[in-house]
């Protein structure tokens, strides 16, 4: 479809409300430090221009590409050099290099304050100007999550609006809002991590890797859909995510709406679980489709061995049509295994490929590849046993101590990584236990390894910004499917020189007493990571004792009248006894 004016086309397709929201998100993801008011001004100017083009597509500049129009607009920001430094150099470039330049300057860890719910002030702002209030939410989330899936953020903004609509008239706004906003924050973090993994996959492994991931996942979700149907959805969905990852949020949202329409029109041949989704309005419909539960397996699925281990024509197909042949294997295997993680399915497909590569060069290929399915058994057993071991530990000690075990584990693997990053990753991995270990056996593995992939990608993204460990770089860049096994295989870094002991690292003050529980935990967990960096060979028992002593010390001093005096007096004693315990 060629349109005289791309901006008019998208404005007409999306409507003013969604158009404005997506432009605001896109701009906030590029210029993460700009004040909200500056972004609103830019968005209003772009929207007025889009309206002009919608009225007359041949008006001046309406034929320009969206990258040109948006890039030109971003480059008008007066404080660009002062606020962003070398990002301003992007403005010297021509498209498409300019947009690529903007993308490379997106900051996954911007130095922005934590957003604290303030029900009274927020309700007043919401009631005074709902559109501005929701715009501010889009802006605040987008600038903290520069790869957030644009159209999905519009959906979450509707949830946010619904929460305030319900809670602001309530007698106890705080009691009504806090649990809702906490739950929304968790969904936002999960959604952000999912899209970041897709964008990282494009950046580091290419479109083929994203397509393979999607073939596996969609075949699990839609086991009755035929290969052509899955191929069509994968192709369209890959385009959608490629656009969003490249900052082309208008095209992305438009194509996503088209895909949702297609899926709903053909739901009979895709999945029986789509009915409830397809009755909803656009944003809810797309979200619902993305999160839809796996359909029941068709009862008549034949065993795979006949076609993929016994057929004489396998090598002909492998040699002459490698990609599509392996694609059909991945589709057929995945649709039969909703109980496997995506990365496990990709590892199985990789093993199948390696076997054919070897066997098809031999004198008697069929005899060689006949036992290929036996080679999948150890691939499946390894993560299953890992999940069992970790869920057993989680059930024994609970979330907080499970997080601590993971912080210790990952600090030993990569002690060079910053403490805040190790604590964040350890805490996220620990929460996977709470999410997945309560599930039925058949759902534990996919839940655990799929969520682990998100947490490890976060580690890779943060490490890419400031690389400190060759072993982490290797795990992050070698293979998407092998990431988790690669990290699992990392042992204590023997080349690491233990960090010098600094008493101030372990010095606590009375301010810890007034912190919310999760921030208190983070303080203690930071100390734990620092202890491991100081004594990487400390035993579990030693660390448990020292951390227990720290917790008791904090509880004791926080219960005292003169808290600060207690911290000042007892702190050095604790530090000394801890050093002794770890000697």
């Amino acid at each position: 479809d060629t349109h005289k004016s791309e901006i008019a086309h998208r404005f007409n397709d999306l409507g003013e409300k969604h158009f404005k929201g997506l432009v605001l998100v896109a701009f906030s993801q590029y210029l993460q430090q700009c004040p909200f008011e500056d972004h609103v001004k830019l968005v209003n100017e772009v929207t007025e221009f889009a309206k002009k083009c919608a009225a007359d597509e041949s008006a001046e500049n309406c034929d320009k590409s969206l990258h040109t129009l948006f890039g030109d607009k971003l480059c008008t920001v007066a404080t660009l050099r002062a606020t962003y430094g070398e990002l301003a150099d992007c403005c010297e470039k021509q498209e498409p290099e300019r947009n690529e330049c903007f993308l490379t300057h997106k900051d996954d860890h911007p130095n922005l304050p934590k957003l604290k719910p303030e029900p009274d002030a927020q309700c007043a702002a919401f009631q005074e100007d709902p559109d501005k209030f929701l715009g501010k939410y889009l802006y605040e989330v987008a600038r903290r999550h520069p790869y957030f899936y644009g159209p999905e953020l519009l959906f979450h903004a509707e949830e946010y609006k619904a929460d305030f609509t319900e809670c602001c008239p309530a007698d106890d706004k705080l009691a009504c809002l806090i649990p809702k906003l906490d739950a929304l924050k968790e969904r936002i973090l999960l959604s952000s991590a999912k899209e970041r993994l897709k964008c990282s996959s494009f950046q580091n492994f290419g479109e083929r890797a994203v397509k393979a991931w999607s073939v596996a996942r969609l075949s699990q979700k839609f086991p009755k859909a035929d290969f052509a149907e899955v191929s069509k959805i994968v192709t369209d969905l890959t385009k959608v995510h490629k656009e969003c990852c490249h900052g082309d949020l208008l095209e992305c949202a438009d194509d996503r709406a088209d895909l949702a329409k297609y899926i709903c029109e053909h739901q009979d041949s895709i999945s029986g679980k789509l009915k409830a989704c397809c009755d909803k309005p656009l944003l809810q419909k797309s979200h619902c489709i993305a999160e839809v539960k796996e359909d029941d397996l068709p009862s008549d699925l034949p065993a795979l061995a006949a076609d993929f281990a016994e057929d004489k024509e396998i090598c002909k197909h492998y040699k002459d049509a490698k990609d599509v042949f392996l694609g059909t294997f991945l589709y057929e295997y995945s649709r039969r295994h909703p109980d496997y993680s995506v990365s496990l399915l990709l590892r199985i497909a990789k093993t199948y490929e390696a076997t054919l590569e070897k066997c098809c060069a031999e004198a008697d290929p069929p005899a060689c590849y006949r036992t290929v399915f036996d080679q999948f058994t150890p691939l499946v057993e390894e993560p299953k046993s890992l999940v069992k071991k970790n869920c057993d530990l989680f059930e024994e000690v609970g979330e907080y101590d499970f997080q601590n075990a993971l912080i210790v584990r990952y600090t030993k693997k990569a002690p060079q990584v910053s403490t805040p990053t190790l604590v964040e990753i350890g805490r996220t991995l620990g929460k996977v236990g709470s999410r997945c270990c309560k599930l039925p056996e058949s759902e534990r593995l996919p839940c655990s390894e799929n969520h682990l992939a998100l947490a490890l990608n976060r580690l890779c993204v943060l490490h890419e910004k400031t690389p400190v460990s060759e072993k982490i770089t290797k795990c992050c860049t070698d293979s998407l499917a092998e990431r988790r096994p690669c990290f699992s295989a990392l042992e204590l870094d023997e080349g690491y020189v233990p960090k010098e002991f600094k008493a101030e690292t372990f010095t606590f003050h009375a301010d810890i007493c007034t912190l919310p529980e999760d921030e208190k935990q983070i303080k203690k967990q930071s100390a734990l990571a620092e202890l491991v960096k100081h004594k990487p060979k400390a035993t579990k028992e030693q660390l448990k004792t020292v951390l227990g002593n720290f917790s008791a010390f904090v509880a004791k001093c926080c219960g005292r009248e003169d808290k600060e005096a207690c911290f000042a007096e007892e702190g050095p004693k604790l530090v000394a006894s801890s050093q002794l315990a770890l000697a």
Epitope: D226, F227, A228, E229, S231, K232, T235, H266, D307, D311, H317, D320, A321, D323, V324, F325, G327, T328
Partner: nanobody, 120 residues
Amino acid sequence: QVQLQQSGGGLVQAGDSLRLSCAASGRAFNYYTMGWFRQAPGKEREFVAKIYWDGGSTIYADSVKGRFTISIDNAKNTVYLQMNSLKPEDTAVYYCAADPSFYPFRPKYWGQGTQVTVSS
């Protein structure tokens, strides 16, 4: 549902060329694998060639490799079989076929068939 309409075929001399066409209609055709089969008198229907929708992957029967070329035009929703260096043993009714799966290729949809006769 996919409908397949064949054209081409006829009587030619050994060594000549012929092109068969098969126009498809119906949804998601672009994601189907298209192929050609043939059935000689008194024999079973046999596989000739197939092509994946993106045009990048093709498989041929050993008996036609190097002489026949399968191609696809997604804009026209049409698949072609270019047959060169024809031999009398290529004489058969040729069927266009379509299936959602590239492998195993067990066609769900068939064209009406078209006669190709190669005289010596």
